[in-house]
């Protein structure tokens, strides 16, 4: 939902978390605000307190249950409201009928590890975290490798158009320090976006053997 300088954006991690950001220019910094979730076919309601993340934006996480519990499905609609304290009452600032599986952003991949490393190549694996079983294999990944003297923004993106939780990096330089990141996105959902990047995995290629061509 957008109106002038106000915006209310939420994403579902596919299991038990809805993360929301509320931004409004000129809003009072010390105002107490919260997000309230009211599902259309569930018996629970949930609230989280919006905390400032910048001069004019606030964020919070609606924790719907245990991290790996499947709290919502493709048919659920959750009415989300931003409520801010105004004197003695709570004023509704923003409202939306949120379709969780149209607004997905998964957790960053975890457990990155080097499976095998050589002079010119490195095999890396990872795991997805708190991803719904509904996706089956309908996920894609992007990966990037940080080379010496470059920035993450300059790193070319490697696209994996299937649920493949490993990659073999090739044409690497021997005895060189690299970093690697990966992110994940379900194929489902009109407003679905990429997960955050994983924590970087640092690795070093093996030195070239003395007296041999490299």
């Amino acid at each position: 939902a957008v109106n002038g300088t106000s915006q209310f954006t939420c994403f579902y991690n596919s299991r038990a978390n809805i993360s929301c950001v509320w931004s409004q220019d000129g809003a009072l910094q010390d105002t107490s605000c919260q997000v309230h979730a009211w599902p259309d076919r569930r018996r629970w309601n949930q609230t989280c307190e919006l905390l400032p993340v910048s001069q004019a934006s606030w964020a919070c996480n609606l924790i719907l249950g245990a991290p790996d519990s499947q709290k919502l499905t493709t048919v659920d609609i959750v009415t989300l409201r931003v409520l801010c304290r105004e004197g003695v009452r709570w004023r509704v600032m923003a409202i939306q009928d949120f379709k969780p599986f149209e607004n997905l952003r998964l957790m960053a991949p975890i457990s990155l590890q080097v499976v095998h490393v050589e002079t010119h190549r490195c095999n890396i694996s990872w795991e997805i975290s708190q991803a719904s079983h509904y996706f089956e294999r309908h996920l894609e990944f992007e990966a990037r490798t940080l080379s010496p003297g470059h920035t993450w923004e300059e790193a070319p993106l490697l696209t994996l158009k299937q649920k493949q939780e490993w990659i073999c990096l090739e044409t690497l330089t021997p005895d060189t320090q690299y970093e690697f990141q990966v992110r994940v996105k379900p194929l489902q959902g009109e407003f679905t976006t990429w997960s955050p990047w994983s924590q970087p995995l640092a690795f070093r290629t093996k030195p070239a053997a003395l007296g041999k061509d490299t």
């Epitope: 209310f8 004023r91 509704v92 923003a94």
Partner: nanobody, 126 residues
Framework: EVQLVESGGGLVQAGGSLRLSCAAS????????MAWFRQVPGMERELVAA????????VYRDSVKGRFTISRDNSKNTVYLQMNTLKPEDTAIYVC???????????????????WGQGTQVTVSS
């Protein structure tokens, strides 16, 4: 502040029609969705219909679907409720409401609305 003034209520025979109007004045630039609620003494106020800022979205309570139509003329700062095939159970005070909340829902509740009119009485006789 926003002021809302309703008109068009009255006494009508069952099966008849009425058109309610709600004129908004004041800080109307802040208004987004508008709605009609109704209240019978001793009962909770209930949503009849709501309409989005641009008129592109609307929602109705089940019991009035196909009989009532909500519309909006932003050039006149007015919202209308056309009520056809009226029934005795439609008898109530009809109240106009406006909200500053951005966005839209099919599940509006009374606390979503910041501004309220005084209401206009609609009586449907059998």
């Amino acid at each position: 502040e926003v002021q809302l003034v309703e008109s068009g209520g009255g006494l009508v025979q069952a099966g008849g029609s009425l058109r309610l109007s709600c004129a908004a004045s004041g800080s109307i630039f802040s208004i987004n969705a508008m709605a009609w609620f109704r209240q019978v003494p001793g009962m909770e106020r209930e949503l009849v219909a709501a309409i989005s800022r641009d008129g592109g979205a609307s929602v109705y309570r089940d019991s009035v679907k196909g009989r009532f139509t909500i519309s909006r003329d932003n050039s006149k700062n007015t919202v209308y409720l056309q009520m056809n095939t009226l029934k005795p159970e439609d008898t109530a005070i009809y109240v106009c409401a406006a909200t500053r909340a951005i966005g839209w829902t099919a599940r509006w509740i009374t606390t979503d609305f910041d501004f309220w009119g005084q209401g206009t009485q609609v009586t449907v006789s059998s």
